[in-house]
Amino acid sequence: IVGGTNSSWGEWPWQVSLQVKLTAQRHLCGGSLIGHQWVLTAAHCFDGLPLQDVWRIYSGILNLSDITKDTPFSQIKEIIIHQNYKVSEGNHDIALIKLQAPLNYTEFQKPICLPSKGDTSTIYTNCWVTGWGFSKEKGEIQNILQKVNIPLVTNEECQKRYQDYKITQRMVCAGYKEGGKDACKGDSGGPLVCKHNGMWRLVGITSWGEGCARREQPGVYTKVAEYMDWILEKTQSSDGKAQMQSPA
């Protein structure tokens, strides 16, 4: 996160850290807890690393430096990448992770509500992006979970800023015209959440951007509302019933 500040314990209890353990262990992506046994993240996090057993998922944590060999983590039972995601495109950058064992909810570890299917009418004015990603383009992973308040921008405006890319209605963009605040490398897969009528909803999944926090280059996020059918289909067919945190 560029231009952010430290988060507090329990402030973003749905935020998880997706880490890979090969010779060393490192944080690669964020994710959002959406049910006892489900995490929503970006498909591109698994490019070149599709093996389930190399991944460790840490939930209910604030500081990555607090993680030791004794810190409990979740393992992956199944990675479900959107069937239309292609490594040659930026579309459908969404994936579900089914955990091997369900998580208990606590003050520091609980799910984010999902938006309504095809939610286009809600005007979100209080949106935040969180993650342990770089604090500048040529930066490094941060220890303490960072947060930043970023306004949504229209897809029309976003397309003007990204003429060389196709911004679809299944994407949502957020950023300041002057730059300075944005997601960055290592924040991929993490949440863009917006508070509406007193409730936090998962509006976007951190996907891509041209650099980080550059002027007139907003961040681009996978629009969760556009994938509600897919999320429900995959979680129900795997579980027999949905265990999602739907909006009240």
Epitope: E89, D164, G186
Partner: antibody
């Protein structure tokens, strides 16, 4: 299956014009950046131009700027290269290519993942 | 413009040998925008590596790419008969996009 098929090459005199076409199939053409690359006989590859998915943004190599125009018709899934004021040094095989733009580490990647078979343009008197 | 300098110009190797091709750039190139292509005589180029290190679809794992900043390498761990040809590095980090002059890999 992704396919790109160039046409329109041939022999033309210096100062003449030619329009190359590239018919695309097997993918959503309107979502992709497209590019032209050329290769003079026995030489290496030289990037010529690219065009954004909507067609609203174009960039050219200095060697062709002001003489070549790239365009596209998304309704026909076709890419074009209008070549005017041709010179002997424009003699080359011209390839159209699809520009893939994936995502890696919250940035985009850019690479030419599919190429046509090429069409030969010969500029000679 | 970003100049791409490939070395060596020609590499003479026997099947089964390891090939190491170098690509140096005149300015910093974001790894996401560095690709390698293979071209055999009379054929269009074929994408091998993108993002400096990711193998394109269908490319065997004997091909690998590494590098960062201004220094990139393509390695073919064990040459197969079909690997002989010319290899190009290419950057799309900044316009104009540019290719290296190529490295020819020939049978020894």
């Amino acid at each position: 299956e992704v396919q790109l098929l160039e046409s329109g090459g041939g022999l033309v005199q210096p100062g003449g014009s030619l329009r190359l076409s590239c018919a695309a199939s097997g993918f959503t053409f309107s979502h992709y950046l497209m590019t032209w690359v050329r290769q003079a006989p026995g030489k290496g590859l030289e990037w010529v131009s690219y065009i954004s998915p909507s067609g609203g943004h174009t960039i050219y190599a200095d060697s062709v700027k002001g003489r070549f125009t790239i365009s596209r018709d998304n309704s026909k899934n076709t890419l074009y290269l209008q070549m005017n004021s041709l010179r002997a040094e424009d003699t080359a095989v011209y390839y159209c290519a699809r520009v893939a733009q994936g995502i890696a580490a919250r940035s985009r990647t850019t690479q030419f993942d599919y190429w046509g078979q090429g069409t030969l343009v010969t500029v000679s008197s | 413009d970003i100049q791409m300098t490939q070395s060596p110009g020609t590499l003479s190797l026997s099947p089964g040998e390891r090939a190491t091709l170098s690509c140096r750039t005149s300015q910093f190139v974001n790894s996401n925008y560095l690709a390698w292509y293979q071209q055999t005589p009379g054929q269009a180029p074929r994408l091998l590596i993108y993002g400096a290190s990711s193998r394109a679809t269908g490319i065997p794992d004997r091909f690998s790419g590494t590098g960062y900043g201004t220094d990139f390498t393509l390695t073919i761990s064990r040459l197969e008969p079909e690997d002989y040809g010319t290899y190009y590095c290419q950057q799309s980090s900044r316009t104009p996009w540019t290719f290296g002059q190529g490295t020819r890999v020939e049978i020894k």
